[in-house]
Amino acid sequence: MSNSVPLLCFWSLCYCFAAGSPVPFGPEGRLEDKLHKPKATQTEVKPSVRFNLRTSKDPEHEGCYLSVGHSQPLEDCSFNMTAKTFFIIHGWTMSGIFENWLHKLVSALHTREKDANVVVVDWLPLAHQLYTDAVNNTRVVGHSIARMLDWLQEKDDFSLGNVHLIGYSLGAHVAGYAGNFVKGTVGRITGLDPAGPMFEGADIHKRLSPDDADFVDVLHTYTRSFGLSIGIQMPVGHIDIYPNGGDFQPGCGLNDVLGSIAYGTITEVVKCEHERAVHLFVDSLVNQDKPSFAFQCTDSNRFKKGICLSCRKNRCNSIGYNAKKMRNKRNSKMYLKTRAGMPFRVYHYQMKIHVFSYKNMGEIEPTFYVTLYGTNADSQTLPLEIVERIEQNATNTFLVYTEEDLGDLLKIQLTWEGASQSWYNLWKEFRSYLSQPRNPGRELNIRRIRVKSGETQRKLTFCTEDPENTSISPGRELWFRKCRDGWRMKNETSPTVELP
């Protein structure tokens, strides 16, 4: 399909997908007729969906094509009826070739589950179309997968409970249809950044939903509340995980992706963020010893405040392959921060800072940084993101995260940045100075910082090194050490990894 490049209307932040001429298969209706003709006439039409059993990690190995009613390839290619069976379902394509994420996912599944069957669902003929046509074809592809699963169920020892459908983008909704149409219930569906356009707000039977499998877990990495969201924003599974808030992924900024503006376009940023869901899942397969944990929260802002780092009542979970089944939940939104690349794991900390007095704060919010010192390592200087504003005589909660395991925390350095960061802040400071010409300088009083680790669920209290000196002002720092009664561990469950 020539000239099949997405036109990205950057300034208006709308994405107008343009693809070339459609391939020789018609819209949903006609194709559905073809797929459901009796077997005698079926052979006249090349199937639009192929099932490629990947018999090797080697991408050059051609694998085996499975087709309903033909048992020989199952025997020839050693299909293991009692093992787990993964169906990988790609999404809309502009190129008509499988992208490299698919190769990585196949390889990671083979590495992790050596006896498993890994089947790539090739629906390129129906996906290499205008986006709207590809969307209309998802139902048909879901039907084809359901027919394959129904046929496999007729075999001895094959169990739907061992089936795990993994769908990326449009493929996630295909997986939903397959789970809906199959006779019985598939064990699990993982939606990797399910497509947003034409699915956002759709009826439960017209998109991926928790009803489509025994367990439906979803990773959202490209959601936008403004412009068109490539990934679906709404929760569509039993658990819906929003890494980094589900929108801007670290390592996917223009600077990161392009290296130099000469070598790429905004398209690469879109691809990087949308595809990040796949790489997070691959990471969970290959870096089992470095699991990433997500925490249940009502929204991204509350998570950024550090309020939601609890593991009580199943409020936290591993992400990706190692996620624990949580069938009692539906549309449970979970959040986490990640690194820019594999392994993606970070260590989350909730910091509760009680400000018991402050002087002459003026209009602008202070800029604080913390450095955490641990038994294993010391953190970099970490910004404290002020989501709303610093409250006086109240406990202010913050979220900080580190890329390395610091071990047990020993001390904390809190720094109040002196110089104004922006012209706007400078102007506000100047205005504040004019209105209060005898302003004796800003000051905050903090006695202690309470820290909770998301990963260990351990709580610690840190007190100022000098109990007489609790004040901090711009350009100054305050040191905190573990209080004498510092090791305070509540009876909260740690996020343990239960391997599926």
């Epitope: 298969f25 639009s48 050059e60 190129s95 190769h103 690469e268």
Partner: antibody, heavy 120, light 107 residues
């Protein structure tokens, strides 16, 4: 044994069109993609585009989107590339190559090349 | 587009020598790098895929290495049939792009 057999050399006038063929044998034609590559005299290789013989879907390098049209005939396991509005810039050796199903798959088997000369 | 640079356009060596041909990508290509050999008669053959995987039938004196943006092809114990032009190619992103080639000549 995998083989890609290309059609013979062509000498054409500017403005003309040409259709180069590439006949595949020794493997299942619909299980791989066919790509076309241009090598101008003494220069490097340039990827023109590919076709997926399974369903006829194509994708061209932007540079060649108005120049090359790719098609296949599944019954004879043959891929074709038509080049139109020929100019002297199109004089080159054109190769067809087989490639696996991923972006990353290498061009594992190549045709012998078809020399195209455009001259008035 | 990703630019592939082979800085050495021509290289002279003797039979039995060990030579290394380098290739640099304008951005990280995640090890999706392939090497090809083109003989003077125009015949093109795949040597190495995925940075270091030897294609079937290719002698073990050929090896590949690298990561990120920098890659190399090494031929140890050069034989007469190795004198040819070598191209690198990235398979990370469309459009697929090739290096300008390194012509290996007999000294």
């Amino acid at each position: 044994e995998v083989q890609l057999q290309q059609s013979g050399p062509e000498l054409l006038k500017p403005g003309a069109s040409v259709k180069i063929s590439c006949k595949a044998s020794g493997y299942t034609f619909t299980d791989n993609t066919i790509h076309w590559v241009k090598q101008s005299h003494g220069k490097s290789l340039e990827w023109i585009g590919h076709i997926n013989p399974y369903y006829g879907g194509t994708n061209n390098n932007e540079k060649f989107k108005d120049k090359a049209t790719l098609t296949v005939d599944k019954s004879s396991s043959t891929a074709y590339m038509e080049l139109r509005s020929l100019t002297s810039e199109d004089s080159a050796i054109y190769y067809c190559a087989r490639k696996g199903i991923y972006y990353s798959s290498p061009f594992d088997y190549w045709g012998q090349g078809t020399t195209l000369t455009v001259s008035s | 587009d990703i630019q592939m640079t082979q800085t050495t356009s021509s290289l002279s060596a003797s039979l039995g020598d060990r030579v290394t041909i380098s290739c640099r990508a304008s951005q990280d290509i995640n090890n999706y790098l392939n090497w090809y050999q083109q003989k003077p008669d125009g015949t093109v053959k795949l040597l190495i895929s995925y940075t270091s995987k030897l294609h079937s039938g290719v002698p073990s004196r050929f090896s590949g290495s690298g990561s990120g943006t920098d890659y190399s092809l090494t031929i140890s114990n050069l034989e007469r049939e190795d004198f040819a032009t070598y191209f690198c190619q990235q398979g990370n992103t469309l459009p697929f792009t090739f290096g300008s080639g390194t012509n290996l000549e007999i000294k």
